[in-house]
Interface confidence: low
């Protein structure tokens, strides 16, 4: 009937009953007309069901969209929402009708029996008991059990509405196998249907396979996996397993339930696939799949089946590793194997045990590497099963940046007299040794601080414009000499001498070596003075207990008031403005010390002497005079070192040798110490004398026997000694053969 | 020649400590671990402990654990085994052996020996 | 008690073959640890024989051999001469008693 109206907008279907609500009594007759501006339809409460029998829905006799509703005799069922709407739209109007049956409060379900409610535990979620009533406003409870509870709306969480029902926590009634809502009327009191509340969960929160990962066996042994499966409460779970040989004989599967503390929110689950033997064809992937119904999670992990144990080095396995000083070293074991090897490290043969320096497992680590640790190191690999082994040698080189031997002596300036030729020496030790050694200079005035310039420690001198010792104009005349290659302290190193023809003015001299991994450098402070002189009687450099005495010549007719000083222990404060080193500046920072004054014809002498000097007399020590005419106070630096004691040490060790008569050996007994031992040789426990057969050279260091004869086995003994001590080595020298006869004889 | 040499023997009573010598020459101390080993009359060869003359680090029987202490002087060469609580039953001749280092995995074998020191403890 | 065993003796006339058995468990022999042989003549230190089954230390003649199979290991003396008459122990290694382990020992008689 409503084809071709005119596309105009809707009035809602106005009802006959103009509310919200509409409250009738039980066994009365309820009737509805609908009036629309097109087809109408109603809804009403379960007319879904049998009921609909009873309700009557029938066409106005006075207008073209209309309807009436009508039911006769109705009961508290009948409560409920009625709806009048347009066909096709969500245009309705709707009416909540109570019917009210005292002696039926609550609107009974379809079934009539009993329903049932779902929840979950979750302390946060709300469950709704659908207890519906016919009666708005009713005291309604609901009743748990067993054990018998009730619950009363409390205003906040708990609540009861006779559209929608018991409103409460779904935590407080789990514990519940029913529920059911009750009214109190007049003191009667009347039941909705029972609830059964079944708890339900689905949420699984992992599923984990033990062993997870790297698994190996060989053939014939046997391989247990575990998979177990975590998940909310009352989740019943069903395994599946996929693997590779599903027609497996031996295989076995055991799923169970573990006991999880009490308290705990989660259930485990536990699937165990156990194959007794093995073989080639049960390698590959094993899933194990969890599924609750509602959610199903997996893993995987890979089974490595090998014919049988063996071991061998990974392709990765590095044959040689280089390393700069200080660094942390790595070095992997990289293998194949089944099952693991036992792993053991040897450096140059010693087995190497762990420390807090060096670490020997799977992964060799040297927490910081020094050039001791340079050597072969060997890994062998042991299988625990089959004991078959392999080794595998690392080469390990050690890198050393350039170190410059001098820089250690931090001082400051020593002073050069004016006119002297002067050698500038740098001492390079570097693995590997230099590739190059350059020297630069610069004035001393051109490298005083600018008052913007912070100098630091590390680096006393803000000189930037270093130029080429080639360019020596304006300085002083220079030669660089060829490097030279020395053993010292048992290390090569290289010297790169700088000769300063004639010192004329002062100046700043930087050697900078480089190699490799990295450089070193040493500035060097040239002060040139035409002032007083420093000389050391009788020694450069005295050992403690020695005497020394420090003398200070000046020239009588320019200097006057020659006093010596020693600097503090703090080193000098560098002022802005001043050059790296104003020791005359600063007198503060200097002790005055007591001297005696000699004369001769043209200077005079300033001598301060040292009576057994001992490391605490080690320093720099100061020179200082006054010019008579302008009073302006000149000062000479010279550093002072002490020499230790050391008692005599052998380095190396004799051998012991087996030779044939008639060949010659030749032995050395390298010693060290302060004051240099002597040296002397034993055999059998007697000094040995010096015969046309046995030679002693180099300070007894060497001894060689020459045409070894039988007498000449035995034990032989090298012995340094100083006023410290003795130190001694021995080895036994074996002679073979027969000894010939001789015409003497 | 490698050479393992032991102190003298020694004659205790019954709750007091023993401490035998054993100096090593002929080759590296400190590259060869060293075992002791105790032989009671008309008995076998009983296993008490080895150090590491290198770091000094030691491991001891558990028959003997709390009991003996196993000690070295790298400046001497010298390995030290003090036994303490002595009763009868320690009457034996105690023997330092060193450890061979031919094969990597074959753990404690001594491939020489001292010729032992005679610790006879009687009241 | 010792957990390794020997034979507390065996015999043979010059020349014949003998050999000493010495039986371990899982947690040494039985565990892929080396088993080592000493010879000890009356009132003088033990002497290695066989180190690592079956190496002969130099100077051990070639009449002395060594093997292990599972838990025990055996050591065979052929060629059987009068100086060979002596004890002779077997020794191992024990993972679980983190120690290393002598055989109770054998006197081989030349008869």
């Known amino acids: 009937a409503s084809v071709g109206l005119p596309s105009v907008s809707l009035d809602l279907p106005r009802l006959s009953i103009q509310k919200d609500i509409l409250t009738i009594k039980a066994n009365t007759t309820l009737q509805i007309t609908c009036r629309g501006q097109r087809d109408l339809d109603w809804l009403w409460p379960n007319n879904q069901s049998g009921s609909e029998q009873r309700v009557e829905v029938t066409e106005c006799s006075d207008g073209l969209f209309c309807k009436t509703l009508t039911i006769p005799k109705v009961i508290g069922n009948d409560t409920g929402a009625y709806k009048c709407f347009y066909r096709e739209t969500d245009l309705a109007s709707v009416i909540y009708v109570y019917v009210q049956d005292y002696r039926s409060p609550f609107i009974a379900s379809v079934s009539d029996q009993h329903g049932v409610v779902y929840i979950t535990e979750n302390k946060n979620k709300t469950v709704v008991i659908p207890c519906l009533g016919s009666i708005s406003n009713l005291n309604v409870s609901l009743c748990a059990r067993y054990p018998e509870k009730r619950f009363v709306p409390d205003g906040n969480r708990i609540s009861w509405d006779s559209k929608k029902g018991f409103t409460i926590p779904s935590y407080m009634i789990s514990y519940a196998g029913m529920v059911f809502c009750e009214a109190k009327i007049n003191d009667e009191s009347y039941q909705s249907i029972m609830y059964i509340v079944v708890v339900v969960g689905y949420r699984i929160y992992d599923v984990v396979l033990s062993p997870s990962h790297g698994i190996e066996l060989s053939v014939g042994e046997k391989l247990v996996l575990n998979c177990t499966a975590r998940t909310e409460l009352n989740v019943g779970i069903d395994f599946n397993w996929e693997y590779p040989s599903s027609k497996h004989q031996h295989k076995k599967l055991v799923n169970r339930d573990l006991k999880t503390q009490s308290g705990s929110e989660m259930k485990k689950f536990l699937s165990t696939l156990t194959i007794d033997g093995v073989t080639r064809s049960d390698q590959g992937l094993y899933t194990c799949a969890a599924s609750s119904g509602l959610m199903t999670k997996k893993n995987s992990t890979f089974v490595r089946v090998h014919e049988k144990p063996f071991v061998a080095f990974g392709s990765g396995m590095e044959s040689l590793v280089e390393a700069t000083v200080g660094e942390r070293v790595r070095i992997p074991a990289k293998y194949l194997g089944y099952p693991p090897p036992e792993i053991k490290w040897y450096k140059n043969g010693i087995p190497l045990e762990s420390n807090h320096t060096i670490k020997a497992g799977h992964v060799l680590t040297i927490m910081e590497v020094s050039e001791r640790d340079t050597g072969n190191y060997t890994v062998i690999l042991t299988n625990p099963i089959s004991k078959e082994k392999q080794s595998h040698v690392v080469s390990l080189v050690v890198y050393v940046p350039p170190q410059i031997g001098e820089k250690s002596l931090i001082s400051p300036v020593d002073s050069y007299q004016y006119g002297t030729t002067q050698t500038l020496t740098c001492t390079v030790y570097a693995i590997p040794p230099p590739h190059h050694i350059h020297w630069y200079w610069q004035l001393e005035e051109e490298c005083a601080n600018e008052p913007s310039q912070a100098v630091s420690v590390t680096n006393p001198y803000p000189c930037e414009e270093w130029r080429s010792v080639e360019d020596f104009q304006g300085g002083n005349k220079i030669e660089v000499n060829k490097n030279q290659f020395a053993l010292i302290e048992g290390k090569n190193k290289t010297v790169s001498t700088l000769v300063i023809q004639a010192a004329n003015v002062s100046a700043l001299y930087k050697c900078e070596a480089v190699n490799k991994v990295g450089r070193g450098e040493r500035v060097i402070s040239f002060h040139v003075t035409r002032g007083p002189e420093i000389t050391l009687q009788p020694d450069m450099q005295p050992t403690e207990q020695e005497s020394v005495s420090l003398w200070c010549t000046a020239d009588r007719s320019t200097f006057e008031n020659l006093t010596w000083y020693k600097l503090g222990p703090q080193p000098l404060p560098i002022h802005v403005g001043e050059l790296p080193t104003p020791v005359c500046k600063n007198l503060d920072t200097l002790w005055k010390l007591n001297a005696t004054m000699f004369s001769n014809s043209t200077n005079d002498i300033l001598i301060m002497e040292l009576k057994n000097a001992s490391l605490q007399d080690q320093g720099d020590y100061v020179c200082l005079a006054q010019d008579r005419k302008t009073k302006k106070r000149h000062c000479v630096v010279r550093q002072l070192t002490v020499l230790e004691r050391v008692a005599p040490t052998i380095t190396g060790n004799l051998e012991n040798q087996t030779t044939s008569i008639g060949e010659s050996i030749e032995v050395s007994c390298t010693a060290s110490g302060n004051p240099p031992p002597q040296i002397m040789w034993f055999k059998d426990n007697e000094t040995l004398v010096e015969d046309s057969g046995i030679v002693l050279k180099d300070g007894n260091r060497n001894l060689t026997i020459r045409r070894v004869r039988k007498e000449d086995e035995g034990l032989y003994t090298c012995q340094a000694c100083s006023v410290l001590g003795c130190a001694k080595v021995e080895a036994f020298f074996i002679i073979e053969g027969a000894q010939e006869k001789t015409n003497l004889e | 020649q490698v050479q393992l040499v032991e102190s003298g023997a020694e004659v205790k009573k019954p709750g007091a400590s023993v401490k035998v010598s054993c100096k090593a020459s002929g080759y590296t101390f400190t590259s060869y671990y060293m075992h002791w080993v105790r032989q009671a009359p008309g008995q076998g060869l009983e296993w008490m402990g080895i150090i590491n003359p290198s770091g000094g680090s030691t491991s001891y029987a558990q028959k003997f654990q709390g009991r003996v202490t196993m000690t070295r002087d790298t400046s001497t060469s010298t390995v030290y085994m003090e036994l303490s609580s002595l009763r009868s039953e320690d009457t034996a001749v105690y023997y330092c052996?060193?450890?061979?280092?031919?094969?990597?995995?074959?753990?404690?074998?001594?491939?020489?020996w001292g010729k032992g020191t005679t610790v006879t403890v009687s009241s | 008690q010792s957990v390794v065993t020997q034979p507390p003796s065996v015999s043979g006339a010059p020349g014949q073959r003998v050999t000493i058995s010495c039986t371990g468990s899982?947690?040494?022999?039985?565990?892929?640890?080396?088993v080592h042989w000493y010879k000890q003549l009356p009132g003088t230190a033990p002497k290695l024989l066989i180190y690592g089954n079956n190496n002969r230390p130099s100077g051990v003649p070639d009449r002395f051999s060594g093997s292990k199979s599972g838990t025990s290991a055996s050591l065979a003396i052929t060629g059987l001469q009068a100086e060979d008459e002596a004890d002779y122990y077997c020794?191992?290694?024990?993972?679980?008693?983190?120690?290393?382990?002598f055989g109770t020992g054998t006197k081989v008689t030349v008869l």
């Open positions: 020794q191992s290694y024990d993972s679980s008693l983190s120690e290393g382990v």
């Open positions: 052996a060193r450890e061979g280092a031919n094969a990597p995995n074959s753990y404690y074998y001594m491939d020489v």
């Open positions: 899982s947690s040494n022999i039985g565990a892929g640890y080396d």
